[in-house]
């Protein structure tokens, strides 16, 4: 395929592999994909450090890379026609394996907007500088390359493989060699964590003599979220060494018998697991599994636990985290209910105030009460509100309908009220006549 697995780092529930080879981004992704992974994500500073570690491992084994500034593909790409979004940490790029946008980014320089071709991201390594945790590889954006033409300074790529869980490395209580074969077809003798479904071949012996024993184990799920090999007791034990070789392969304490045999044991507060090697805390609450203010409560025999929430909170679907109880769903208030963290409060609608019989009750506010009326003239209280009225010759005015404004009867909608002259007055009007004319008894006509 033009790529060699040179390095592997397994941590948490993922393994990262670094490969050297001048491949295009598509070829690199295809290589990762064939073994069940994707080009690596770098979604946090922690993940950036894992990727840096696997690259450092690769560089220690790689004789000489051709470019001082070497680039390694990761799984961040932007499709053709999708434009740059400077407001986002990933600038419109997305991870090839899918998943949400993440806040972490480490761009090498300001990105140029270009929507006409697909763009891919690589990690930029300055090989003249040592790789330090404080100096994480920068993200460099550019063309994705094509078969035979990977792009300038592309020296390899990083894959990521995710797993249900990991097994602890097998502990040898005497001379021997363990070889792990991972589901992504990498063989290694030194893994900090070994992914689920890996095989382990154990060859016991000094190496120069014929090997006396060999064992085969699979990393499997022994019980929910418990990943183990199913081996019982330390492997390759030798009376010649007793507890002196690798602490007898024991996780904590090793106790020797007089006949060269030995047993593993645990410190106070821990118990020996079925593998007779590993120790686990007796108190499952010691790992603080409960979140969000939840208290960890031990179950019978101290084997299990449940999480308990404070007043006004309840466990979410994970049964580990506390979420606020929405007390308003039970309609405890007469009118408005406002949910608050750990509780609730009742509020009244406009025109009502707290009061009356019962918890959370509301009563009408008498807006027309003495000294309180918002109206310029007449005020009538209603349930939850009020309305203003005006004396004859005035109409309600103002944005809130509380003011009274004189009606200009001289420009009334029915046309002129007077035959000749019309004089508007506060709340009324009167008619007049031109010189030589007299106002008739009806107060409207001129004679």
């Amino acid at each position: 395929t033009g790529a060699d697995t040179e390095a592997v780092v397994c941590v948490g529930t993922a393994c990262y592999t670094a490969h050297s080879g001048k491949l295009s981004a598509a070829e690199a992704q295809n290589h990762c994909n064939q073994n069940g992974g994707n080009l690596a994500t770098v979604k946090s500073k922690e993940e950036a450090q894992h990727v840096q570690r696997v690259l450092a491992q690769l560089l220690r084994r790689e004789a000489a890379l051709t470019a001082r500034m070497s680039k390694f593909w990761i799984g961040l790409q932007r499709e053709k026609g999708k434009c740059l979004d400077p407001s986002l940490p990933l600038k419109g790029f997305s991870w090839v394996g899918g998943g949400e946008d993440t806040p972490y980014s480490n761009w090498h320089k300001e990105l140029r907007n270009s929507c006409i071709s697909k763009r891919c991201v690589s990690l930029l390594l300055d090989l003249s500088q040592p790789l330090l945790p404080s100096r994480l590889p920068k993200w460099s954006e550019g063309p994705c390359g094509s078969p035979g033409s990977p792009g300038s300074n592309i020296e390899g790529f990083v894959c990521k493989f995710s797993f249900k869980g990991m097994c602890r490395p097998l502990a040898l209580g005497g001379p021997g060699q363990v070889t792990y074969t991972t589901p992504f077809q990498t063989t290694s003798s030194s893994l900090e964590a070994v992914p689920f479904a890996s095989a382990a071949n154990v060859a016991c012996g000094e190496g120069d003599k014929d090997e006396t024993q060999s064992h085969y184990f699979l990393c499997k799920e022994k019980a929910p979220d418990v990943f183990d090999w199913g081996s019982s007791g330390p492997l390759c034990v030798s009376p010649k060494y007793g507890c002196n070789f690798n602490n007898g392969g024991c996780h904590q304490d090793c106790f020797e018998g007089g006949d060269g045999s030995f047993l593993c044991g645990c410190r106070p507060g821990f118990r020996l697991l079925d593998d007779l090697v590993t120790c686990a805390s007796r108190n499952p609450c010691s790992s603080s599994p409960c979140r969000g203010g939840a208290t960890c409560v031990l179950g019978p025999h101290g084997k299990n636990y449940t999480c308990r929430c404070p007043q006004g909170y309840q466990l979410d679907s994970s049964q580990l985290d506390c979420v606020d109880v929405d007390e308003c769903q039970d309609s405890p208030c007469a009118q408005e209910c406002v949910n608050t963290p750990g509780g609730f409060r009742c509020e009244c609608w406009v025109g009502y105030e707290p009061g009356g019989p019962g918890e959370g009750a509301c009563q009408d506010v008498d807006e027309c009460a003495l000294g309180r009326s918002p109206c310029a003239q007449g005020c009538t209280n209603t349930d939850g509100s009020f309305h203003c009225s005006c004396e004859e010759g005035y109409v309600l005015a103002g944005e809130d309908g509380t003011q009274c404004q004189d009606v200009d009867e001289c420009v009334g909608p029915g046309g002129p009220l007077c035959d000749s002259l019309c004089f508007n007055t506060q709340g009324s009007f009167h008619c007049g006549c031109l010189p030589g004319w007299v106002l008739a008894p009806n107060g409207v006509s001129c004679t």
Partner: antibody
């Protein structure tokens, strides 16, 4: 489709031993736990033990340890339950059951009736 | 070992009526991953048991939706919304959180 086919009924005398088989098909035999469950006449279900055929790893219920041996042959996709020093109280139906990825016992064999009588 | 108590021992039901079976465990079956490892099986007369509910509330493939499972860390309930004649048999609850796996004593559902 997934199938577990068990060997036929057995009648044994006290003190004898017996090996029941369970032939699996329709799934990756090596990658799933294979359990054995006992049901005494008119009684409930009891988990006896299990095997992971991929590497032969076994776990036993303490109640049955020493009396039963579980084994598997990857090449033929067959699991075995060996019962030694049979007693009348071993008279029961023995089921082989696949354990799935949700820790459920999702596929059951038809059961093998073992009668121990002098 | 985790011990469970199933009740009632026997449950006579009229077809079309609902039915409810309880199961109580000696310790919580809630794992720190948020999953409850409680299962329900039905053994019809003369047959092998069959899986009904996995991980407390999930319906197994091919099981009618009149069956439902619920509960907390130690107390669980299997409900049948409307019992049908084909539902007769012995119902078992089981835990697969901690070895050895254990089953409840069983509840015999019969038609009135």
């Amino acid at each position: 489709q997934v199938q577990l086919v068990q060997s036929g009924p057995e009648v044994k005398k006290p003190g004898e031993s017996l090996k029941i088989s369970c032939k699996a098909s329709g799934y990756a035999f090596s990658s799933y736990w294979l359990n054995w469950v006992r049901q005494m006449p008119g009684k409930g279900l009891e988990w006896m033990g299990r095997i992971y055929p991929g590497d032969g790893d076994t776990d036993y219920n303490g109640k049955f340890k020493g009396q039963v041996t579980i084994s598997a042959d990857k090449s033929s996709g067959t699991a075995y339950l060996q019962l030694s020093s049979l007693k009348a109280s071993d008279t029961a139906v023995y089921f082989c059951v696949r354990g799935d990825g949700y820790w459920a016992m999702d596929y059951w064999g038809q059961g093998t009736l073992v009668t121990v009588s002098s | 070992d985790i011990v469970m108590t199933q009740s009632p021992l026997s449950l006579p039901v009229t077809p079309g009526e609902p039915a409810s079976i309880s199961c109580r465990f000696s310790q919580s079956l809630l794992h720190s991953n948020g999953i409850t490892y409680l299962y329900w099986y039905l053994q019809k007369p003369g047959q092998s048991p069959q899986l009904l509910i996995y991980q407390m509330s999930n319906l197994a493939s091919g099981v009618p939706d009149r069956f439902s499972g619920s509960g907390s860390g130690t107390d669980f309930t299997l409900k049948i919304s409307r019992v049908e004649a084909e539902d007769v048999g012995v119902y078992y609850c089981a835990q697969n959180l901690e070895l050895p796996w254990t089953f409840g004593g069983g509840t015999k559902l019969e038609i009135k």
